[in-house]
């Protein structure tokens, strides 16, 4: 059978395009350095394709290699303010399951007010992503200054 | 039929491979911030499989999710320049139709002298991606130091 | 006969995925400015799946167009460090065969430590990919700070 | 195809000045971003001062407040006026389409005493 027709015949999860891109929802309360997520079309441009929020965390529903990205820019941001409340520090890992708990993306912002990067790394089912902004500097909640995201690359 | 031989028997553009990498080709007249891109084997290491160019902005032919990247260096610059010429920003966006006009990424240089970024977004057949740079510093015609594409990920 | 069996049925590398990820292992000696990558499971979260290392430099088993990303951070660094020790630039290329020779990505860090990007563009087999670090300030060797991977997007 | 041609090169004393012409061959030049480089033998070319087809102007940092670019659209021409010349400014200064990778020839300057 013709894979163009096999491609339609067969939901799109089952070829293992899992895919999600998030913009922020929140931060957390004091002392929880995390960033709270949130998707979905109604939002804007966010979505999310196999993977799962879990109170604002990233789930991942299926083993595999993962590209996972992420930009975060300052929300009242110069490079002196930047210097000024340094170290300011974005790290992305693995939070739970405990066993699994790792850091997989750091970036500090020196001087400046935007991070950008991404990894490829092995994820397995269950693992739920943590992005950790720690400092005393706030993130833009504008979706095209701060998003996160992870795309499922092979298994 | 195995998918090796039938991946062989169909052309890549019906499996939604569609892939843009491209160089800088000049910056806009003046009140035009958008920068104005080529792409093609005989130009050096850019290609256009599927998007085309219309006017040296990125059109698309494909429905999807698609990876967006850009990295964009300053010509003639240093922490100093750029600093001196805040603010610099560069912003990628869909410009047309306008009714689908939106921002999709925004990054600025406050004291550095390169952005880098990528994300995901769904993008539609028709659709025109726009790079305006505002402020008056000029960028980077190197091929290794301004760059921009964009890769279909899923439908 | 369906995709997802078919998919089960074929070795991956005959579709194609071949992708990589590698960790710092360390710097070349005096005169010699390329950055030693090592990959595996054993190691962490770095692996190989088609690609090779060769003397620690990454070497391409299949033609086609490839996702290229690295992030590298400096070891002892604020923004003043980085900037009293400008410049200090990273460029990744093929530098080998010498007949394909060519710079494909190239950033300074200017005043900050940490310079992260990725491009798309085509490899053939037998490219060997070099990443020169050049100026006086060393990287540091932690897998979420400087990484250095490759992922095969399409023929 | 434009083509450059630079002239106004020579030998000057520390603290002298110089203005270097362009003349470009093609009606786009209009057109076009233009850019002065220099190149000191055994080393890379250096972007000095860059000029779009509006008049917006940029700098390297060591030329700022020397050196000058400025263009005459109806003759065809950009000038780079340089000012509080020292030793190290002695090299093969180039004019170029900037965003074309159009180069001319070059012209030598020379600063000692």
């Known amino acids: 059978q013709r894979f163009a027709q096999a491609q339609q015949q067969l939901p799109l999860e089952s070829l293992g395009w899992d895919v999600a891109e998030l913009q922020l929802n929140h931060t957390g309360p004091q002392q929880d350095p995390r960033l709270y997520w949130q998707g979905g079309p109604a939002l804007g441009r966010s979505f999310l394709h196999g993977p799962e929020l879990d109170k604002g965390q990233l789930r991942i529903h299926r083993d595999g290699i993962y590209m996972v990205h992420i930009q975060v820019t300052l929300a009242i941001c110069s490079s002196t303010t930047a210097s000024r409340h340094h170290p300011t520090t974005l790290a992305v890992g693995i939070c739970s399951p405990a066993s699994r708990s790792i850091s997989l993306l750091r970036l500090s912002f020196h001087q400046g007010c935007t991070i950008a990067s991404q990894r490829l790394t092995p994820l397995a089912r269950g693992d739920t992503l943590c992005t950790n902004l720690t400092g005393t500097l706030l993130p833009s909640r504008n979706t095209d200054e701060t998003f996160f995201g992870v795309q499922w690359v092979r298994p | 039929q195995r998918f090796a031989q039938a991946q062989q028997q169909l052309p890549l553009e019906s499996l939604g491979w569609d892939v843009a990498e491209l160089q800088l080709n000049h910056t806009g007249p003046q009140q035009d911030p958008r920068l104005y891109w080529q792409g093609g084997p005989a130009l050096g290491r850019s290609f256009l499989h599927g998007p085309e160019l219309d006017k040296g902005q990125l059109r698309i032919h494909r429905d999807g999710i698609y990876m967006v990247h850009i990295q964009v260096t300053l010509a003639i610059c240093s922490s100093t320049t750029a600093s001196r010429h805040h603010p610099t920003t560069l912003a990628v966006g869909i410009c047309s139709p306008a009714s689908r006009s939106i921002s999709l990424l925004r990054l600025s240089f406050h004291q550095g002298c390169t952005i880098a970024s990528q994300r995901l977004t769904p993008l539609a057949r028709g659709d025109t991606l726009c790079t305006n740079l505002t402020g008056t510093l000029l960028p980077s015609r190197n091929t290794d130091e301004t760059f921009f594409g964009v890769q279909w990920v899923r439908p | 006969q369906r995709f997802a069996q078919a998919q089960q049925q074929l070795p991956l590398e005959s579709l194609g995925w071949d992708v990589a990820e590698l960790q710092l292992n360390h710097t070349g000696p005096q005169q010699d400015p390329r950055l030693y990558w090592q990959g595996g499971p054993a190691l962490g979260r770095s692996f190989l799946h088609g690609p090779e290392l060769d003397k620690g430099q990454l070497r391409i088993h299949r033609d086609g167009i490839y996702m290229v990303h690295i992030q590298v951070t400096l070891a002892i660094c604020s923004s003043t460090t980085a900037s009293r020790h400008h410049p200090t630039t990273l460029a990744v290329g093929i530098c080998s065969p010498a007949s394909r020779s060519i710079s494909l990505l190239r950033l300074s860090f200017h005043q900050g430590c940490t310079i992260a990007s990725q491009r798309l563009t085509p490899l053939a087999r037998g490219d060997t990919l070099c990443t020169n670090l050049t100026g006086t300030l060393l990287p540091s060797r932690n897998t979420d700070e400087t990484f250095f991977g490759v992922q095969w997007v399409r023929p | 195809q434009l083509q450059l041609v630079e002239s106004g090169g020579g030998l000057v004393q520390p603290g002298g000045s110089l203005r270097l012409s362009c003349a470009a061959s093609?009606?786009?030049?209009?057109?076009?971003?233009m850019g002065w480089h220099r190149q000191v033998q055994g080393k890379q070319r250096e972007l000095l001062a860059l000029i779009t087809s509006g008049g917006s102007t940029n700098y390297a940092d060591f030329v700022e407040g020397r050196f000058t670019i400025s263009r005459d659209n109806a003759k065809n021409l950009v000038y780079l006026q340089m000012n509080s010349l020292k030793p190290e400014d002695t090299a093969v200064y180039y004019c170029?389409?900037?965003?074309?990778?159009?180069w001319g020839q070059g012209t030598q300057v020379t600063v000692s005493s």
């Open positions: 093609a009606g786009t030049f209009r057109f076009k971003t």
């Open positions: 170029n389409a900037y965003y074309d990778d159009i």
